[in-house]
């Protein structure tokens, strides 16, 4: 399939001009190669009419140009002084020959309609309304006023001042006068359809002294806006239908031959094909709303329409807006698994792609919720604290520059199954959707921490061990301390007397972490894990409680606190000693259906920027060391 995209059909009238935009994939070669516009003719030949190399055919001499916009990955063909002879089939394309990558465009040039010289032309969009102004002389003020629609043989009544209304205009046509002005009457026709287009005659009075006015009503289908998006990226349909439908239910549908199948509406309907990757967001009281679709698939390409009607379904005579969506399969967005599987008690690591040109953008992870219009509350972000209910089991690992950040969720339960979105406050196209499936665990995890009821005594030495199988012998082992700003990996070198040490006993294949002496700040969640370079392997989590020696009572751990976790991380965690200042933007985040909301979270999260100081609050550093004895069994 060609990755070139443009308007399938372009319509104009004789003497007018057209501007045709064609899109191409974002590559250096494409930006610099020849662009052309050719006309399809006999024996499958396509005759060049204009190209970016400077060629201009005699048919187009003085009336056409072609401009390349490499920064937008588009080129535009402008043609003026159109004639009916220009009606035909064309191609816009890229390449040294006209057999290169191209897109078929039909150009329709209609005759200028022959209208009586005094005809007033009204041009309106489908679903809108028109108010036709009908002037008359004072002597016809007491006479009957009417509007009729011309057919070949006669003029069919639409409405008159005696309250006669044509059945097809009942509830849509109103004849009225404004104030005390006795020289004009008005006819308003609402919910316009294609069938309403045509010639009308306004009349006041009868016979030769009657006042008549010719009216040409043109009812236009909206021009589809072209959207060129990459496979796996996201698209936002911004729908602005006007204040008059502000209180009606809204919908987005996709054209399917003669019908338009609803994908989502504000009454709760949603196409199962879009489960987990769609949101509809009312913008304001002026009838504006947007629909966001992530994880674009090639079958999502097509003709979309948004509208408003109390039924939440497409209805003739109601305002609409349309788009033609093209999904470019030569995507810059890497092909990642869209389904991630985990087991209860285990964990998952999700690699989220982002635009590598925007490494400093703020990264987020949200959970898609389908109730109502759908929303995606943020669970964690680079500068956003982890939501309370995910304490100890969720972290975002950002490694700026490589185009991926990783999210780890552990201590999984079946309730964690669902759809999650990766998003940033930068390039919105890079929003991706992941479905998390959680099955019941059927075997022991690879990593196990002892003791499982970990209560350390203040001032004493406390050791926890992480047991791992021999298959992990060549991988690096680590411990990290979790906080609601990330999981801070303990440094791999000694930094002072008060130290945490990590050692590996080759016979029992374990990594031990020692806190010596135990301080109150040591209380909290710790993760033990394995990794290879920047690719993180499995992990398990443990909660270490700290008690004073005299207390004697055992510490109550959080529910499921020490459930074991399995993860596969792909990035090194960054330092997360972030100020404890509350992040006000996160507790009740919006659905993130538009950039502004993400930006707001991002702006407020600036307060919580990592300080870069890996030290503990009292200035004493923690450290750990790791010895690997590779022992084969």
């Amino acid at each position: 399939k060609s990755p070139i995209f443009g308007p399938q059909e372009v319509s104009s009238i004789e003497g007018d001009s057209v501007s045709i935009t064609c899109y191409y994939p974002d590559t250096s070669v494409n930006r610099h190669t020849r662009k052309y516009w050719c006309r399809q003719g006999a024996s499958g030949m396509c005759t060049t009419l204009i190209s970016s190399n400077g060629y201009l055919s005699k048919e187009y001499s003085g009336r056409a140009n072609l401009i390349n916009f490499p920064e937008n990955n588009t080129f535009v063909i402008n043609i003026e002084q159109l004639t009916q002879d220009d009606t035909g089939s064309y191609k816009c394309g890229l390449g040294t020959s006209n057999r290169g990558l191209s897109f078929d465009v039909s150009l329709e040039v209609s005759q200028v309609p022959e209208l009586p010289s005094d005809t007033h032309v009204y041009t309106k969009d489908i679903g809108r309304n028109v108010t036709i102004e009908c002037p008359f002389k004072r002597e016809n003020a007491p006479s009957k006023k009417s509007l009729c629609k011309k057919t070949n043989q006669s003029c069919e009544l639409v409405i008159d001042s005696t309250e006669k209304v044509n059945p097809s205009y009942i509830g849509r046509a109103k004849l009225f006068m404004k104030g005390t002005d006795l020289t004009v009457f008005y006819v308003n026709i609402s919910h316009l359809t294609h069938n309403d287009a045509g010639l009308y005659i306004c009349q006041a009075g009868e016979g030769p002294s009657a006042d008549k006015k010719n009216v040409d009503l043109q009812v236009l289908a909206p021009e589809p806006e072209l959207l060129y998006k990459d496979l796996r990226s996201s698209v936002t349909f911004e729908c602005d239908l006007g204040r008059e439908v502000a209180n009606e239910a809204k919908y987005l549908c996709r054209m399917n031959k003669e019908t338009c199948d609803v994908i989502i509406n504000t009454l709760g309907k949603r196409d199962p094909d879009f489960e987990g990757r769609i949101l509809i967001t009312p913008k304001d009281d002026n009838g504006r709303f947007s629909v966001l679709i992530t994880g674009l698939r090639k079958e999502d390409a097509g003709h979309y329409q948004c509208g408003a009607h109390s039924s939440g379904l497409p209805q003739e005579g109601w305002p609409i807006q349309t788009w033609q969506l093209f999904v470019n399969e030569e995507s810059t967005i890497p092909n990642r698994r869209s389904v991630v599987k985990g087991v209860t008690g285990g964990s998952v690591a999700i690699a989220c792609p982002y635009n590598p040109k925007e490494s400093s953008s703020l990264k987020y992870w949200c959970r898609w919720e389908g109730d109502g219009n759908g929303h995606c509350p943020v669970l964690v972000g680079t500068q956003a604290q982890v939501q309370e209910e995910y304490e100890g089991r969720l972290a975002l690992f950002d490694q700026p520059g490589n185009g991926t950040y990783t999210v780890i969720l552990n201590q999984l339960t079946t309730e964690d199954a669902g759809f999650y979105w990766c998003l940033t406050n930068g390039d919105s196209r890079w929003r991706t959707t992941i479905e998390l499936q959680v099955a019941e665990a059927t075997r022991e995890p690879n990593l196990e921490v002892t003791p499982q009821n970990a209560t350390a005594v203040l001032g004493e030495t406390f050791t926890v061990s992480c047991h791992y199988p021999c298959k992990f012998y060549s991988q690096e082992k680590y411990w990290c301390k979790w906080s609601n700003k990330g999981c801070h990996i303990l440094p791999s070198h000694d930094e002072g007397a008060r130290q945490s040490s990590v050692s590996c006993d080759q016979s029992s294949q374990l990594v031990s972490m020692t806190l010596n002496p135990v301080s109150k700040e040591d209380e909290g969640w710790y993760w033990c894990g394995v990794k290879q370079g920047q690719t993180y392997g499995e992990t398990t989590a443990i909660y270490i409680a700290v008690e004073e020696r005299t207390r004697g009572s055992s510490h109550v751990n959080p529910t499921d606190a020490n459930a074991r976790a399995k993860v596969a991380l792909e990035e090194e965690v960054v330092d997360s000693s972030i100020s404890e200042k509350e992040n006000k933007a996160i507790p009740n985040p919006g659905p993130f259906a538009n950039e502004r909301e993400i930006q707001n979270v991002g702006d407020q999260a600036q307060e919580n920027r990592a300080s870069g100081d890996a030290g503990s609050a009292d200035g004493q550093s923690r450290s750990s060391s790791s010895k690997h004895h590779h022992h084969h069994h």
Partner: nanobody, 119 residues
Framework: QVQLVESGGGLAQAGGSLTLSCAAS????????MGWYRQTPGNSREFVAR???????HYADSVTGRFTLSRTQDKNTVSLQMNSLKPDDTGVYYC?????????????WGQGTQVTVSS
């Protein structure tokens, strides 16, 4: 040279249906656009519908929603399905085929087929 043969005209009641067909032969491979025009009593020939080589269809406002134009896989035959016919639709319907020669547009026309809609 392109030859166009029309069929399917006749008499129909208002609200009824008719289907017109047009088969192209000769150098039909180069046809760019195919469609229908009509000449109604007392009027000049007017555009009804056409289909382009990329399967895009265009209709006159007066027939939008009532008439449907389609074509066969080999692109050499077009059919005009006319529903909800009105007396105004009465006239002679002409098949049209357009070819771009590489430098000019050439239009070919059929002989015409009569459609009469009675009220």
């Amino acid at each position: 040279q392109v030859q166009l043969v029309e069929s399917g005209g006749g008499l129909a009641q208002a609200g009824g249906s008719l289907t017109l067909s047009c088969a192209a032969s000769g150098t039909a491979a180069g046809i760019d656009v195919m469609g229908w025009y009509r000449q109604t009593p007392g009027n000049s020939r007017e555009f009804v519908a056409r289909i382009f080589s990329n399967d895009v269809t265009h209709y006159a406002d007066s027939v939008t929603g009532r008439f449907t134009l389609s074509r066969t896989q080999d692109k050499n035959t077009v059919s005009l399905q006319m529903n909800s016919l009105k007396p105004d639709d009465t006239g002679v319907y002409y098949c049209n085929a357009r070819i771009w020669t590489g430098s000019t547009t050439v239009d070919y026309w059929g002989q015409g087929t009569q459609v009469t809609v009675s009220s």
